[in-house]
C-alpha cells in the first residue's frame, strides 16, 4: 500500500507535521455512522489537504471525507465495522501520512442528556438520573458513565462516580449542607467497543438543604 513505509525501521518516515486523530460515532443519525478526523496541530495549512478512508468498507473500496472548517467528516452506512481501515491524508493523489484504524476502537458516544437531581426528604438522599441515546442503539448499547459533581465554590475539586446504569443515589450526609452543587455526566463505550469519553452533558445545579438544628438533619429546599 502507498502512503506508509514497509517495515518497522521506516515506520516514522511519515511527515510528523500531518499527525491526526479520529473518532467514530455509530448510528449517530438513524442507521448512519460517522467518522470525524482533525489534525493535531491547529496551525497546519489545510487548504489542499484531503482525507480518504480505504478498506473495511461495504460495496466500495474507498470514501472521501467532507471538509467542515477545521475538521474532516464522513457520514455513511458503509462501515463494515470489522477489520482495519486505512485513513490517509492526501494532496491530490499523493498520501502524506496514513493510519490503520479499527473503527470499533475509536468510538466516542453521544453526550448524555436530561440530567436531573431530585431530593428525597424521607430517605435523606439525592436521586441523580440522566438519559442517553445509546439505550436505543443496536451497536454501542453498553456504556460506562462518569458522574462528576462539586461544590460550586471548589473550582477543581470534582468527585467522580463510575456507574453502568443511568441512576445514582447520593447520600445527603456525604454533601455539605446549604451548599450549591454542580453535577455533570459523560459516557465511554464498555463491552467490545472501545474509544473515548463523550462530551460532558450540560451541567445541572442543585442546592443541599440547611441542617435542621433540633434533629441535626438538613431542611428540604
Amino acid at each position: 500500500e502507498s502512503g506508509y513505509a514497509q517495515n518497522g525501521d521506516l515506520e516514522d518516515a511519515e511527515l510528523d507535521d500531518y499527525s491526526f486523530s479520529c473518532y467514530s460515532q455509530l448510528e449517530v443519525n438513524g442507521s448512519q455512522h460517522s467518522l470525524t478526523c482533525a489534525f493535531e496541530d491547529p496551525d497546519v495549512n489545510i487548504t489542499n489537504l484531503e482525507f480518504e478512508i480505504c478498506g473495511a468498507l461495504v460495496e466500495v473500496k474507498c470514501l472521501n471525507f467532507r471538509k467542515l472548517q477545521e475538521i474532516y467528516f464522513i457520514e455513511t452506512k458503509k462501515f463494515l465495522l470489522i477489520g482495519k481501515s486505512n485513513i490517509c491524508v492526501k494532496v491530490g493523489e499523493k498520501s502524506l501520512t496514513c493510519k490503520k484504524i479499527d473503527l470499533t476502537t475509536i468510538v466516542k458516544p453521544e453526550a448524555p442528556f436530561d440530567l436531573s437531581v431530585v431530593y428525597r426528604e424521607g430517605a435523606n438522599d439525592f436521586v441523580v438520573t440522566f438519559n442517553t441515546s445509546h439505550l436505543q442503539k443496536k451497536y454501542v448499547k453498553v456504556l460506562m458513565h462518569d458522574v462528576a459533581y462539586r461544590q460550586e465554590k471548589d473550582e477543581n475539586k470534582w468527585t467522580h462516580v463510575n456507574l453502568s446504569s443511568t441512576k445514582l443515589t447520593l447520600l445527603q450526609r456525604k454533601l455539605q449542607p446549604a451548599a450549591m452543587y454542580e453535577i455533570k455526566v459523560r459516557s465511554i463505550p464498555d463491552h467490545y467497543f472501545k474509544g473515548f469519553w463523550s462530551e460532558w452533558s450540560p451541567s445541572y445545579y442543585f442546592r443541599t438543604p440547611e441542617i435542621n438544628n433540633s434533629s441535626g438533619e438538613m431542611d428540604p429546599i
Epitope: I82, D102, Y192
Partner: antibody
Framework: QVQLVQSGAEVKKPGASVKVSCKAS????????LHWVRQAPGQGLEWMGG????????AYNQKFKGRVTMTSDRSTSTVYMELSSLRSEDTAVYYC???????????WGQGTTVTVSS | DIVLTQSPDSLAVSLGERATINCRTS??????????MHWYQQKPGQPPKLLIY???NLESGVPDRFSGSGSETDFTLTISSLQAEDVAVYYC?????????FGGGTKVEIK
Amino acid sequence: QVQLVQSGAEVKKPGASVKVSCKASGYRFTDYELHWVRQAPGQGLEWMGGIDPKTGGTAYNQKFKGRVTMTSDRSTSTVYMELSSLRSEDTAVYYCARSGGRWYFDVWGQGTTVTVSS
Amino acid sequence: DIVLTQSPDSLAVSLGERATINCRTSESVSIHLLHLMHWYQQKPGQPPKLLIYGASNLESGVPDRFSGSGSETDFTLTISSLQAEDVAVYYCQQSIKDPYTFGGGTKVEIK
C-alpha cells in the same frame, strides 16, 4: 510480501522457561497487533494472548496469567513470547499470528515446536 | 469462557459436492449485524489459514466456493464444490470476548 518468521524448535525440562521470537516483515510493524496461539499434538487451537507493538499493551488468556510474558522490539519488528514454569502439557506448536481485525488472525507464522520433557 | 461446538467431527464428501460445517456457541457472538465469528483451514504440518472473517466476509485470495453465514449462536461454513485441495481440518473462532476461543475442528475428507 507479508511474513511472520518464528525462531526454531526448543526442547526444555519441566520448570524451565522458553522464549520464542516472531519477526514481522512486509508491512508496518506498529499497524497490527500480534498474538500467540498454541496447538498441542493432535489437538485444537488455543489463544494465549496478544501484544500491540505500538503501545506495548498486552492481553493475556487468564489461563496463562503469571506464566506468559509478551514483549516487542520495534527496532527489529520482532515480538517475543516467554512461557515460564513449563510442564509436559505445554508441549505444543506455538504460532504467532497477526490480527487483521478484532480479533481474527489473517497472517500466521510457520510455528515453533516446544517440547517439554525430563 | 465461550464454548464453540463444531459438527460434525469429520465429514467425507465426494469431489464437486457440497460440504457444510456447523459451529454453535455457548452464548451470542453477535452485536446487531456485527458477527464476531471466523473460519480457518489447516492442512497437516501447516499453520491455520484465514478463510472467512465476520461470519460471511471472504478473506482476500480465498476461492469463492467458500462461504460463511449465521448469527448469534449458530454459524455455518459451506464449501459449494469440494476440491481435492480442500482436504483439511476447519476451525471456527469467536472474538467477542476474551479469551478468544476456537472450536474443536472438523476434518474434511474425500469420499
